[in-house]
């Protein structure tokens, strides 16, 4: 029995619903009484949802899963996962047994966009060319962990003296803090870009130092 799932991961935003597609080709005369369907976590073998003896056996996974009962007879064994959490991320296996048996695994990729970075400067007054300043770029509640890039006003990457740290909250989302230590020129703009690698979403923040006062666009 051939079981088909998408090759690419299913990407779902935290808090939204996701459909993990799985399909099989029922033979003529197929009835749901013949169908055994099991969804489980690929790595831990934990049961997620099942269908047997013509009945939906329900969710074994935090009561957030559902099948598409009206579509099962047509070979649609897809699973609906509600209110996606970071902890849901991973591989799910769809097992289908009629007379024959088949299985396939589909990957769920969870994502959450990062907030627009906030920029802070230390020290933040009486700055002169040649002073060393610490610029902190902070962006919040994203997933997965971000890449952070710094550049100057001319678009030249700044890679030295950068320290980036991630902080996980209780929901598994990340706050990212990146610190750039730089010696000031006569004036300049310093930008940080926080990139979510799954969403290919870039969040930008910048600070312009023009003697006095400073501006935070």
């Amino acid at each position: 029995l051939e079981v088909q799932v998408p090759e690419d991961p299913v990407v779902a935003l935290v808090g939204t619903d996701a459909t993990l597609c799985c399909s099989f080709s029922p033979e003529p005369g197929f009835s749901l009484a013949q169908l055994n369907l099991i969804w489980q976590l690929t790595d831990t073998k934990q049961l997620v949802h099942s269908f047997a003896e013509g009945q939906d056996q329900g969710s074994a996974y935090a009561n957030r899963t559902a099948l598409f009962p009206d579509l099962l007879a047509q070979g649609n064994a897809s699973l609906r996962l509600q209110r996606v959490r970071v902890a849901d991320e991973g591989s799910f296996t769809c097992f289908v047994s009629i007379r024959d048996f088949g299985s396939a695994a589909v990957s769920l990729q969870v994502a959450a966009p990062y907030s627009k970075p906030s920029m802070t400067l230390e020290p933040n007054k009486d700055l002169r060319p040649g002073d060393t300043v610490t610029i902190t770029c902070s962006s919040y509640r994203g997933y997965p962990e971000a890449e952070v890039f710094w550049q100057d006003g001319q678009g030249v990457p700044l890679t030295g003296n950068v320290t980036t740290s991630q902080m996980a909250n209780e929901q598994g989302l990340f706050d990212v803090h990146s610190v750039l230590r730089v010696v000031l020129g006569a004036n300049g703009t310093y930008s940080c870009l926080v990139r979510n690698p799954v969403l290919q979403q870039d969040a930008h923040g910048s600070v312009t130092i023009t003697g006095q006062p400073m501006t935070f666009p």
Epitope: D43, V86, S165, G172, F174
Partner: antibody, heavy 121, light 108 residues
Amino acid sequence: DVQLVESGGGVVRPGESLRLSCAASGFTFSNYAMNWVRQAPGEGLEWVSRINYKGYNITYYADSVKGRFTISRDNSKNTLYLQMNSLRAEDTAVYYCAKSGSNSNNFFDYWGLGTLVTVSS
Amino acid sequence: EIVLTQSPGTLSVSPGERATLSCRASQSVNSKLAWYQQRPGQAPRLLIYDASSRATGIPDRFSGSGSGTDFTLTISRLEPEDFAVYYCQQYKNWPPLTFGGGTKVEIK
């Protein structure tokens, strides 16, 4: 069953290089962040480096190895690597490959048996 | 960097007795703390994650508690195979991922 098997350790002189490998099986390798943790003789555990999952190749290093060590992974071969350059005597340790429990929670739920790296003149 | 301090450095206990190990963080790690056991000549093994959740296959004589900065690993009745070194590790704020210095549990 999850298995992590390190290889590539040995005796080298200060300044030389070594490449460690970790062959993974029993789980969907590409779905998990992976780490190297080391333990100097008679000492405690020290996290060395982490690479995140899929092919995003976002990497992190302990300050003690930054600029000298490079972590990488080949998801098609289910293998994690640690390229160690400019080795120092203080890098002498057993190096463990460790799987992150999840991608947001970086505890280490499975460890290899370790491979010994000795840096000595 | 979050520093983890474990105490005591060595704990002498008789088999069958209770052992209580402490781990203190230099700043709050919420519940992002794990405990590991390392027997001589072996790799570490995960016991507890998220401060109080037992890892797969870990006997229920091992329990973890605490949140914020103060954490405890309790072994209710020490078995011969429990004599080992125990490490705590935080994963709230990284890099670096940091470990405590370890507590050796030895036979009294």
